[in-house]
């Protein structure tokens, strides 16, 4: 094939090589950019900046090499449009620094920076950490800082991400209240800070105030939905990013729902309880306190991380006729109490009950102070019992 006379020539099925001396001063309008997986650039002294717009449309790019060129600056967001980038070789350029943000969000298997006049500062603490942790092939490069010695020997005691303290109200917060949060940011070289409020939705009206180093946030007219929702303060400096999340507990009274008993491998009387603080629960059977045992007990489902409501079952392992009756769930917290009742009929007497025998009880009197996986089975017979439809 005839030699390619252009600044950039195809290389393989999805590669591009740009090696003609001084032919490029930016990466705009590269031919076939949208399908490129590999881009090799060499001897481009006029290519001094790499910015967000330069790599727009290179969404498939996996390997980027810019070597022996004049690159002095790579923007923190330069690789925003190349999320699949896994190998980045920027050796033998004029880079003095490279922001931690530049590589954030990428899964780089290889990062080559040798041959650059790096300037040791806290802004390269992230790279020093890569070297310490053996990431991206960095240790093998034995990176040097221009006139300062090895990167590995750079003092880093003062190179920390910002320190955040979020102040939340001590007092109880009620539905309808306004809540003021304050985020105090400390640290060197603070660049940006803010709040992440994506979980809040309709939980409150939000008003931001202030700026570095003290950010204010007012949550007005809060609802009970604010419970378990993260309010996050973040801050960045040249070393990295810090985040602190807090939750505001909004008090509200206990509520409870009971549903019709359902038969699974065992029987379940489904319930839902809500309230902040979390309510204490107590079951009554036919009006008397039910003592929980391995045959009848409260079983909670895994709670959702972002809500206060708890779902569960009063689980009954192979109940009999003595368990037929009225079940009441009492829920109480300092802001109120609630109850719900349901009748459950599990089966008729399977033991040929003699009317002259005393009727057994399976509950404790109200003033009692008692604290309180089935085997894999082959069924020998059709179980007794009546099916109860889910309500």
């Amino acid at each position: 094939a005839a030699p390619c006379p252009d600044a950039c020539c195809p290389h393989g099925s999805s590669g591009l090589r740009c090696t003609r001396d001084g032919a490029l001063d930016s990466l705009h309008h590269l031919p076939g950019a949208e399908n490129l997986t590999e881009l090799y650039i060499e001897n481009q002294q006029h290519l001094q900046h790499l910015e967000l717009r330069d790599l727009r449309g290179l969404g498939e790019l996996r390997n980027l090499t810019i070597v022996k060129s004049g690159l002095r600056f790579v923007a923190p967001d330069a690789f925003h449009f190349t999320p699949r980038l896994s190998r980045l070789n920027l050796s033998f350029n004029a880079l003095e620094s490279l922001s931690w943000k530049t590589v954030q969000g990428l899964s780089l298997q290889e990062l080559v920076l040798s041959g650059n006049p790096l300037h040791c500062s806290c802004a390269l603490r992230w790279l020093q950490r890569w070297e310490e942790e053996g990431l991206g092939g960095v240790p093998e490069q034995k990176l040097q800082c221009h006139g300062q010695g090895p990167l590995a020997h750079m003092p880093n005691a003062s190179c920390g991400v910002p320190t955040l303290k979020v102040q939340v109200p001590n007092a109880s917060v009620d539905v309808g209240d306004d809540v003021l949060l304050r985020c105090q940011v400390e640290g060197r070289g603070l660049e940006q800070a803010g709040w992440i409020l994506t979980e809040l939705e309709q939980s409150a009206t939000v008003m931001k105030s202030g700026g570095l180093p003290s950010l204010g946030l007012t949550l007005a007219n809060v609802t009970s939905d604010l419970n378990r929702k993260n309010v996050t303060c973040w801050a960045e400096n040249d070393v990295g990013r810090a985040e602190v999340s807090v939750q505001v507990n909004v008090s509200f009274p206990a509520s409870v729902q009971l549903h019709t008993a359902v038969e699974m491998h065992h029987w379940c009387i489904p319930f839902s309880v809500d309230g902040q603080p979390a309510p204490s629960l107590r079951w009554l059977f036919n009006g008397s306190v039910l003592n929980e045992t391995s045959f009848i007990f409260t079983e909670f489902l895994e709670p959702a991380a972002n809500e206060t409501v708890r779902h569960g079952c009063l689980r009954l392992n192979q109940p009999t006729h003595v368990n037929n009756g009225n079940y009441t769930l009492l829920a109480a917290n300092p802001f109120g109490q609630a109850s719900a009742s349901i009748m459950a009929a599990f089966m008729d007497n399977p033991f040929e009950f003699n009317p002259e025998d005393p009727i057994p009880v399976s509950f404790s009197p109200v003033d009692t102070n008692s604290t309180s996986g089935d085997p894999v089975e082959k069924k020998d017979e059709t179980p007794f019992g009546v099916s109860v439809a889910v309500g």
Partner: antibody
Framework: EVQLQESGPGLVKPSGTLSLTCAVS?????????WTWVRQPPGKGLEWIGE???????NYNPSLKSRVTISVDKSKNQFSLKLSSVTAADTAVYYC????????WGQGTLVTVSS | SSELTQDPAVSVALGQTVRITCQGG??????ASWYQQKPGQAPVLVIY???NRPSGIPDRFSGSSSGNTASLTITGAQAEDEADYYC???????????FGGGTKLTVL
């Protein structure tokens, strides 16, 4: 499959406290099961001591209630038995098991009360 | 009463059917479970609840209940079935568990 393993001293002095631990493996102690202790004096039958749920609920044999404490340690996936003021009548093989059906048992550990 | 009563000993000819019984007031209200125990070993669950058999237990073992009596039936007893058998159930309050005194089964 769930396995249970009792451990603790095989000899306890009269009036002392018997302490045993049951380690649960092959399953979580925080599952929807209760955990129980049963004992069997030499040449005699089985006696239920008590049961516990990972949320702290517990029930004890009324004849032993004043002397028994059963506790659970979720972080170690184990539960324990303490029996105070022991006498020679408390000499037995002590078993831990999964309640309510006692479908998995430990191999048992003999505890002798003697001076 | 919160007691379960079993016959101390029962024998059966090899291959024949044997019934081991357990009596107690609480059995009018609650199911019995049955355990087999061989010398020097921990008990093994053979029947629980409404006549359920755990995985691995031969189908010659079955359970039933009538009035205040629960029964474990072995249909076609084998030599390896020779063991002590214990019943258990909830007591009449439903809050505690109780065991029967055990039945020693001999297979002749």
């Amino acid at each position: 499959e769930v396995q249970l393993q009792e451990s603790g001293p095989g000899l306890v002095k009269p009036s002392g406290t018997l302490s045993l631990t049951c380690a649960v493996s092959g399953g979580s102690i925080s599952s929807s099961n209760w955990w129980t202790w049963v004992r069997q004096p030499p040449g005699k039958g089985l006696e239920w001591i008590g049961e516990i749920y990972h949320r702290g609920n517990r029930n004890y044999n009324p004849s032993l209630k004043s002397r028994v404490t059963i506790s659970v340690d979720k972080s170690k996936n184990q539960f324990s038995l303490k029996l105070s003021s022991v006498t020679a009548a408390d000499t037995a093989v002590y078993y831990c098991a999964r309640a309510p059906w006692f479908d998995y048992w430990g191999q048992g550990t003999l505890v002798t009360v003697s001076s | 009463s919160s007691e379960l009563t079993q016959d101390p000993a029962v024998s059966v000819a090899l291959g024949q059917t044997v019934r081991i019984t357990c009596q107690g007031g609480s059995l009018r209200s609650y199911y019995a479970s049955w355990y087999q125990q061989k010398p020097g070993q921990a008990p093994v669950l053979v029947i629980y609840g409404k006549g359920n058999r755990p995985s691995g237990i031969p189908d010659r073992f079955s359970g039933s209940s009538s009035g205040n009596t629960a029964s474990l039936t072995i249909t076609g007893a084998q030599a390896e079935d020779e063991a002590d058998y214990y019943c258990n159930s909830q007591d009449s309050s439903g809050n505690h568990l109780i065991f029967g005194g055990g039945t020693k089964l001999t297979v002749l």
